[in-house]
């Protein structure tokens, strides 16, 4: 998260860290007791490593009573996701067991109504991704409030040049932005999960390259079918 600040500890009990060999790789969001939603591209970086999900965390390194690392029983990338595009960049991870819920671990309601979020709406994005152009990675969860950007502006030739489909949404990226390591994390508007940070190689913090988020409402049928 660029230009953000440390989040209030455990105030986002849905927040997950998707880890490979014990190292944070991507964000994720608990959407059901045994399921975490993330970005499909995150699996590419996992290679043959052991994928696990950390729930109930604020600090990645410090012991916390609510922290627990879960093994992954099943990883389900969206069937249409591809390595060379950010289309359908969603991944569902089934935990080895149901998460132990409490004040610091709780699923987040996700948007089922397939309607665009009003441009200008302030949405919260959080993660353990890099916090500066230097690439420094934080130990504690960071967050930032970003205004939603209308698709027409996001698709301008000077911006993303038509790459933003109806199944994606954009948020402003002027110094405040999601970045490397935040992929798969939640974009939350009005207490509801609206988007998942895509995991392309986009430059961060540049207002002409807005943040791209996969709209979960556009994938409600797929999510329901996997969770069923």
């Amino acid at each position: 998260i660029l230009g953000g600040r440390e989040a209030e500890a455990h105030a986002r009990p849905y927040m997950a860290s998707v880890q490979v060999n014990g190292e944070h790789l991507c964000g994720g969001v608990l959407v059901a007791e045994q399921w975490v939603l993330s970005a499909a591209h995150c699996l590419e970086d996992a290679a043959d490593g052991k994928v696990q999900v950390l729930l109930g965390a604020h600090s990645l390194s410090q012991p916390e009573p609510s922290k627990r690392l879960y093994d992954v029983l099943r990883a389900v990338p969206h069937p249409d996701s591809r390595p060379d595009t950010i289309d359908h960049d969603l991944l569902l991870l089934q935990l080895s067991e149901k998460a132990t819920l409490g004040p610091a671990v709780r699923p987040l309601p996700w948007q089922r109504v397939d309607r665009d979020v009003e441009p200008g709406t302030l949405c919260d994005v959080a993660g353990w991704g890099i916090v500066s152009h230097a690439g420094r990675r934080p130990d504690r969860l960071q967050h930032v409030l970003l205004p939603v950007l209308d698709r027409a502006t996001c698709n301008r030739r000077t911006h993303h040049d038509g790459a933003i489909t109806q199944r994606m949404m954009c948020a402003e990226s002027n110094r405040r932005d999601s970045c490397k390591g935040d992929s798969g994390g939640p974009l939350v508007c009005g207490g509801v999960l609206e988007g998942v940070v895509t995991s392309g190689s986009r430059v961060c913090g540049n207002r002409k390259k807005p943040g791209i988020y996969t709209r979960v409402a556009s994938y409600a049928a797929w999510i329901d079918s996997v969770l069923a």
Epitope: I130, A134, G135, R137, K180
Partner: antibody, heavy 113, light 106 residues
């Protein structure tokens, strides 16, 4: 423990090229940025450029564009700095740095005929 | 390009003395980093994001500032603090270093 191990000192002739390596341990280079910084004898630090090893994206100080090429091999957790058309002005110590936080020990490059 | 000017270029301080050095930018910057380089060693990150202490750095070091003016303070000078200190900005590309302040022990 995070460590960056750089290749040994180089003595090269003017006009030649050299490739310096930086092998990381204790972390996966794909998860951060690797920077290269130079320091000429008795001078200050100069940022050369950086690479995002996950996708190969690079960014350079315009002053070093064409002179320096940064690459990475994620399979060996190693970053490289190639310097071309060397002159005496390129005589310096070159450091690789993880996120500007963890520094390698530096590689001394001397350009002399 | 953001030019960072550090002052003084050279200074000396006695053990226990408070030390302050400055870094001035020719245009407004943010995300200032400070590094320490002892003779014959690689630089070491001291301060990131203007005022945050890097891991393992003694609490006698502190950073502050905004806009075009930043400073690094050592509350009580110790012999091991004799080194050259560099500032670096991370808000305007290309990301530039200052010329350094050499701190000697009296």
């Amino acid at each position: 423990e995070v460590q960056l191990q750089q290749s040994g000192a180089e003595l090269v002739k003017p006009g030649a090229s050299v490739r310096l390596s930086c092998t990381a341990s204790g972390f996966n280079i794909k998860h951060t940025y690797i920077h290269w910084v130079s320091q000429r004898p008795e001078q200050g630090l100069e940022w050369i450029g950086k690479i995002d090893p996950a996708n190969g994206n690079t960014k350079y100080d315009p002053k070093f564009q064409g002179k320096a090429t940064i690459t990475a091999d994620t399979s060996s957790n190693t970053a490289y700095l190639q310097l071309s058309s060397l002159t005496s002005e390129d005589t310096a110590v070159y450091y690789c740095v993880n996120a500007m936080e963890y520094w390698g020990q530096g590689t001394s490059v001397t350009v002399s005929s | 390009q953001s030019v960072l000017t550090q002052s003084p270029a050279i200074m000396s301080a006695s053990p226990g003395e408070k030390v302050t050095m400055t870094c001035s930018a020719n245009s407004s910057v943010s995300d200032m980093y400070w590094f320490q380089q002892r003779p014959g060693s690689s630089p070491r990150l001291l301060i990131y994001d203007t005022s945050n202490l890097a891991s393992g750095v003694p609490v006698r070091f502190s950073g502050s500032g905004s806009g075009t003016s930043y400073s690094l303070t050592i509350s009580r000078m110790e012999a091991e603090d004799a080194a050259t200190y560099y500032c670096q900005q991370w808000s305007t590309y290309p990301w530039t270093f200052g010329g350094g302040t050499k701190l000697e022990i009296k």
